[in-house]
């Protein structure tokens, strides 16, 4: 009988071993090895038994020792099993953005590698396993499906295999894959809420604001909004799972009309947009005119106001008549009319919204001087001694400055509070005097002495 | 309008000497008129003032040796008696209360007398 | 009676520098108070009237204040042409006075 030791070889590819051959008698007719491996007789052998080297092992074989006793021929084969790790372990590429909510699908391939019976594949995330598969064919290709949440944004998922020949070999084989990181995106199905005058008038500053709740991750998203060809440079803020993106737009003539605002929200792989309709109008306001800003009391004025053709417009609350773009009356010029304001509104309907626009002119009527004898009495009897204060008011537009001297050098001290004496009593006369000219009125004042009363 | 004196120079103690101020552009039914003097390198003193009516009023220490009296068109200043302390420039002046700020600065351009034996 | 005290008699200044001239009244004159300005051997020629009231041509560094009895002059930033005398007058009442006018502040601008 022919014995072979070690009946069963674990060795690495390309790795030598040792294999004793031997026969059951003392002195065999022949003993000797049958394999297509390179060999190599390690002398001295002994009188029943041989011991040969066998090198660069590629792949598993069974070598034969025969040995020829005079009660016969046998044989005895070694197991030769050849270990080697995968060449090639790889994750594919995952998809650059991934909805949360949907199954991802991990694929990984594994070239070479043996003995494949103690090969296992595994897909990973970070550290934790996902799956666990024999590996089976050449490439050996495994997958796994996995639901995905937003805290896989930025994880790490990848592939690794583990050759394990415990007992025979003490060690574990790993070989992994380069990590992928995952980037997941949630956005919701609901579009941007887009706020923004749906009225813009010409060289006015509107703001536009579009806003969307439900971001995943929020910092990632990219906003987009335009008025019709004009990009608008938004200020973005960022919540925890909403932005709200604020931009202000100025509009020309040359954008009259309506116009389209768009804001996109885009995250990952995919868009949201909001459209909305804003008319772009142009409203000068209306123009007030009076035949002269300045004019001297008694003078017609003609009060007129013209507006845009579409607009209507009131002067000073009352309506054109008939309804219409322009509006006028006539008026004789007062003292009382100094300073009134004319006031024209007008209001226009655009896009179904009514934007009004007003215009004020003050009419300045010049008049006077005036003395009257309500505002400056031409006579006052005052107790010697007694604390009194004349009074004496000039009317007109320009003011007219006012002075009162008796005999043209004493002046009466006008709105002050004096001590009567007797040096107050005569007539003065005051004079009243503007650009417009100048008017005079006599004031006597009489002190009474305490002997009289 | 304008104011000027005449009728300054030397005069000896104890005479008698009449100041004449004429006045153009303007009527002295309309304004009271005044009469100032400065004696060499002092200050400016005030003697009186005849009203648009014709009243006279005098600085207390002038009354007596003063008198002022006005025509249509001219205001006098009578010196009776003159001492060599009466010797100065003296200035005709138009009540600054004339006319509403503009005409506060009508002095004439002063006449000198001189007293001295 | 309404007569008039003026301080200080004489005050020096640098260019630039300012001047504060006072003017007292014996009885209340309002704001019927003139100030002028009296170079030699010219007659006095008018800077404020009303107390306040900046009569024309007359630069803004010159500014009047004061009603009643008590009357400033104040003369900021001043300048070489600014050498003169300076007289206030009340301009209340003609009788009862012994004199009209201050005394007279004499500026010497170094």
């Known amino acids: 009988q022919t014995s072979v030791f070690p009946p069963e070889v674990i060795l690495p590819r390309g790795g030598s071993v040792k294999v004793n051959c031997s026969a059951s008698c003392d002195q065999p007719i022949s003993l000797g090895m049958e394999t297509p491996l390179p060999k190599k007789e390690i002398l001295p052998g002994g009188n029943n038994w041989k011991m040969y080297e066998l090198s660069n092992v590629q792949e598993d074989s069974q070598p034969m020792c025969y040995s020829n006793c005079p009660d016969g021929q046998s044989s005895a084969k070694t197991l030769l099993t050849v270990y080697w790790t995968p060449e090639r372990v790889e994750l594919a590429p995952l998809p650059p953005w991934q909805p949360v909510g949907k199954n991802l699908t991990l694929r990984c391939q594994v070239e070479g590698g043996a003995p494949r019976a103690n090969l296992t594949v595994m897909l990973l995330r970070g550290e934790k396993e996902l799956s666990r598969q024999s590996a089976v064919g050449e490439p050996a290709e495994v997958t796994t499906t996995v639901p995905v949440g937003r805290d896989d944004h930025g994880a790490n998922f990848s592939c690794r295999t583990e050759l394990d020949l415990r007992p025979y070999v003490l060690k574990l084989f790993e070989n992994t894959s380069a990590p992928h990181q995952l980037q997941t995106f949630d956005l919701p199905a609901t579009p941007p809420q887009l706020v923004s005058p749906q009225v813009l008038e010409v060289d006015t500053q509107g703001t536009v604001v579009c806003s969307l709740d439900g971001l995943f991750p929020v910092s990632e998203a990219q906003v987009s909004l335009a008025l019709g060809d004009q990009k608008l440079n938004p200020t973005i803020t960022y919540g925890n799972n909403s932005l709200s993106a604020k931009a202000s737009v100025k509009v020309t003539a040359e954008e009259e009309g309506t116009q389209q605002l768009l804001c996109g929200v885009m995250l990952g792989n995919q868009t949201q947009e909001t459209r909305q309709t804003v008319t772009i109008y142009s409203f000068p306001a209306p123009n007030v005119n009076l035949t002269k800003p300045e004019v001297s009391e008694g003078t017609e004025v003609i009060v007129e106001c013209e507006a845009h053709p579409r607009a209507k417009v009131m002067l000073n609350g009352v309506p054109a008549q008939p309804p219409g773009p322009r509006a006028q009356f006539l008026l004789k010029a007062t003292p009382e009319d100094n300073g009134r304001s004319f006031s024209c509104s007008a209001t226009l309907e655009v896009a179904g919204q009514l934007v009004h626009k007003n215009q004020t002119r003050e009419l300045r009527v010049l008049y006077g001087p005036r003395l009257d004898e309500k505002d400056c009495p031409g006579n006052w009897t005052w107790p010697e001694n007694s604390q009194q204060t004349p009074m004496c008011q000039a009317w007109g537009n320009p003011l007219p400055q006012l002075k009162c001297l008796k005999d043209g050098t004493f002046p009466l001290p006008i709105g002050q509070s004096v001590t009567v004496t007797r040096d107050l009593e005569g007539t003065y006369l005051c004079q009243a005097r503007s650009t417009r000219g100048e008017v005079t009125r006599e004031v006597t004042v009489n002190v009474l002495s305490p002997r009289y009363e | 309008q304008s104011v000027e004196e005449s009728g300054g120079g030397l005069v000896k103690p104890g005479g008698t000497l009449t100041l004449t101020c004429t006045v153009s552009?303007?009527?002295?039914?309309?304004?009271?008129m005044g009469w100032v003097r400065q004696a060499p390198g002092k200050g400016l003193e005030y003697i009186g003032i005849?009203?648009?009516?014709?009243s006279t009023y005098y600085a207390s220490w002038a009354k007596g040796r003063f008198t002022i009296s006005k025509t249509s068109t001219t205001v006098d200043l009578k010196i009776t008696s003159p001492t060599t302390e009466d010797t100065a420039t003296y200035f005709c002046?138009?009540?600054?209360?004339?006319?509403f700020g503009d005409g506060y600065r009508l002095w004439g351009p002063g006449t000198l007398v001189t007293v001295s034996s | 009676a309404y007569d008039m005290t003026q301080t200080p008699a004489s005050v020096e200044v640098a260019v630039g520098g300012t001047v504060t001239i006072k003017c007292q009244a014996s009885?209340?004159?309002?704001?019927?108070l003139l100030w002028y300005q009296q170079k030699l051997g010219q007659r006095p020629s008018l800077l404020i009237y009303?107390?306040?009231k900046l009569a024309s041509g007359v630069p803004s560094r010159f500014k009047g204040s004061g009603s009643g009895t008590e009357f400033t002059l104040t003369i900021s930033g001043v300048q070489s042409d600014d050498a003169a005398t300076y007289y206030c007058?009340?301009?209340?009442?003609?009788?009862?006075?012994?004199?009209?006018f201050g005394g007279g502040t004499e500026v010497v601008v170094k």
């Open positions: 007058q009340q301009a209340y009442s003609s009788s009862n006075v012994d004199n009209a």
């Open positions: 002046v138009r009540d600054p209360y004339d006319s």
């Open positions: 005849i009203g648009s009516s014709g």
């Open positions: 009303d107390a306040s």
């Open positions: 009885e209340n004159i309002y704001r019927y």
């Open positions: 552009g303007f009527s002295l039914s309309s304004y009271a």
